[in-house]
């Protein structure tokens, strides 16, 4: 009795199943009772020796080609084998390599979680992704897996991640790279410093006192409110960064506290209260103000 | 590699001026804040001045100890950042350190340039 | 300005020590935007330049060592070497960058 090793597809294609079945035309496995087991190269495949004459592998990979043979044992403890069947497992190339992030968009705040995700719409087997910073092209890192996605994150933003990425996959066919992906960096502003400026060391009634805020960091267009007592006296826009003035023509209600607030879209910080005094200077005719 | 290299620190009377340069390398120097900061002898670190990029309008800012006597600049196309000093006082005897700003903190440092004012 | 105050301004350790130093705010540095406090860590050797331990608190630089750990969150901060090595000994920063720079005025590591 001859024995015949089928594998069905004859051609996988990587991750995908098989079934291999060890076949006897000239024998029904009814007319006795048959143990059957499947080899690769000199391996023993699956359980072992088993009743079924078919074996189920659950996904093929590129390591798995291979020659292929099963052999039945009757009880009588005949042992029959069939021929050698080369299965070529079929790898697909990585294709349409994709780079995109989180959030989507690239923009991301300051101090925020990046995930920059690394995708391929075809590919099989381990592919390796690795991951570059700026067109110069820093390594930052590099995984293999069985995925068609990966993930490179920073945990907390800086503004030194404010650059150009891509990223490239690759499964033994050669490096496929994705398009550039820039991501931009929001800061919040910090707290912002009030300054008041007169035009001379103790400003009197009628000058023209100069409310300067200004908060060192923080992405434009950068708002700024200007408070005397918590009551609104304006704002002022900076559009391209640093501060912004507000101008006041003093009278004797101006004294009291003064303060600013900047906002960026990313939240408003108050910058701390100046106060403002009028003073009497001994035979002086008219009030000061002092700070 | 990332290089920042300050010059131009010496012994200068008080009331006088110098200028202090940093060549830098290994970075875009374009689209960082830079800021000069200070080491009197002995002592803690101060910050002297700031100059944002050129997205941010080249916005300046100086510690108040230095208002309206220092002046901090910048050429992107050489990268190169500048600090003039005038009507120099003996307090501002220091080691100045040319200093990139990553996200408010002090990621590379220079490796400073002496300033001596005594008469 | 926001005053940084570090404690204690000297310490005495043999190596392989546990060692922790403090710093104090005078205003808290949890920004809301983020919820990161803007607090760095520095570690200046003598006759060197400062070199970034730490930011954002707790966010370790890329290069430092891991035994170098920085924690705390508003006005209390911590930085912890959990064996301290020879190469340690240095003077060390807190900086608050929440508004306008401000450093402490150090803590000094010596050998014992």
């Known amino acids: 009795a001859e024995l015949f090793l089928i594998a069905s597809p004859s051609h996988p294609t990587e991750g995908s199943p098989v079934t291999l079945t060890c076949k006897m035309p000239f024998l029904q496995s009814s007319d006795a009772q048959f143990q059957f087991c499947f080899f690769r190269d000199t391996r023993a495949l699956g359980p072992g020796w088993s009743s079924s004459p078919k074996l189920q592998i659950a996904a093929m990979w590129k390591e798995d080609t291979g020659s292929y043979w099963c052999e039945a044992q009757t009880m009588a403890s005949k042992v029959l084998r069939s021929r050698r069947s080369q299965i070529n497992v079929h790898r697909v190339p990585v294709a349409d390599v994709s780079l995109e992030t989180q959030p989507p968009g690239g923009q991301v705040m300051e101090g925020d979680r990046l995930v920059l995700i690394c995708s391929v719409a075809m590919g099989t087997g381990d592919i390796t992704f690795l991951w570059y910073k700026g067109a110069v092209g820093l390594n930052l890192q590099s995984k293999t897996q069985r995925s068609l996605t990966a993930e490179y994150e920073i945990p907390s933003v800086r503004e030194s991640d404010a650059e150009q990425y891509y990223c490239v996959a690759e499964n033994g066919y050669g490096p496929s790279p994705s398009g550039l992906v820039s991501i931009t960096v929001r800061i919040p502003v910090s707290r912002p410093i009030l300054m008041l400026r007169a035009p001379r060391a103790q400003a009197a009634v009628e000058d023209v006192l100069e409310l300067h805020c200004e908060a060192l960091r923080g992405s434009p267009p950068i708002l700024y409110w200007f408070y005397h007592e918590d009551i609104t006296l304006g704002s002022r826009s900076a559009p391209s960064g640093g501060g912004a003035s507000f101008n006041l023509s003093l009278t004797e209600e101006h004294s009291g506290n003064y303060s600013c607030e900047a906002n960026n879209g990313l939240g408003a910080q108050r910058s701390e209260a100046v106060t403002l005094n009028f003073t009497v200077p001994t035979g002086a005719r008219s009030n000061h103000l002092t700070s | 590699e990332v290089r920042l290299v300050e010059s131009g620190g010496r012994l200068v009377q008080p009331k006088g001026s110098l200028r202090l340069s940093c060549a830098v390398s290994?970075?875009?120097?374009?689209?960082?804040?830079m800021y000069w900061i200070r080491q009197a002898p002995g002592k803690g670190l101060e910050w002297v001045a700031r100059?944002?990029?050129?997205?941010?309008?080249?916005?300046?800012y100086y510690a108040d100890s230095v208002k309206d006597r220092f002046t901090i600049s910048r050429d992107d196309s050489q990268s190169m950042l500048y600090l003039q000093m005038n009507n120099l006082k003996t307090e501002d005897t220091a080691m100045y350190y040319c200093?990139?700003?990553?996200?408010?903190?002090?990621?590379?440092w220079g490796q400073g340039t002496t300033l001596t004012v005594s008469s | 300005d926001i005053v940084m105050a570090q404690s204690p301004s000297s310490l005495a350790v043999s190596v392989g020590e546990k060692v922790t130093m403090s710093c104090k705010s005078s205003?808290?540095?949890?920004?809301?935007?983020?919820?990161?406090?803007?607090l760095a860590w520095y570690q200046q050797k003598p006759g060197q330049s400062p070199n970034l331990l730490i930011y954002?608190?707790?966010s370790r630089e890329s290069g430092v060592p891991d035994r170098f750990t920085g924690s705390g969150s508003g006005t209390d901060f911590t930085l912890t070497i959990s064996s301290v090595q020879a190469e340690d000994l240095a003077t060390y920063y807190c900086?608050?960058?929440?508004?306008?720079?401000?450093f402490g005025a150090g803590t000094k590591l010596d050998l014992k």
């Open positions: 100059i944002r990029s050129k997205t941010n309008n080249f916005a300046t």
């Open positions: 205003q808290s540095l949890l920004h809301s935007s983020n919820q990161k406090n803007y």
């Open positions: 954002w608190a707790s």
């Open positions: 200093v990139r700003d990553n996200s408010g903190s002090f990621d590379y």
């Open positions: 290994g970075f875009t120097f374009n689209t960082y804040a």
């Open positions: 900086q608050q960058y929440y508004s306008y720079p401000t």
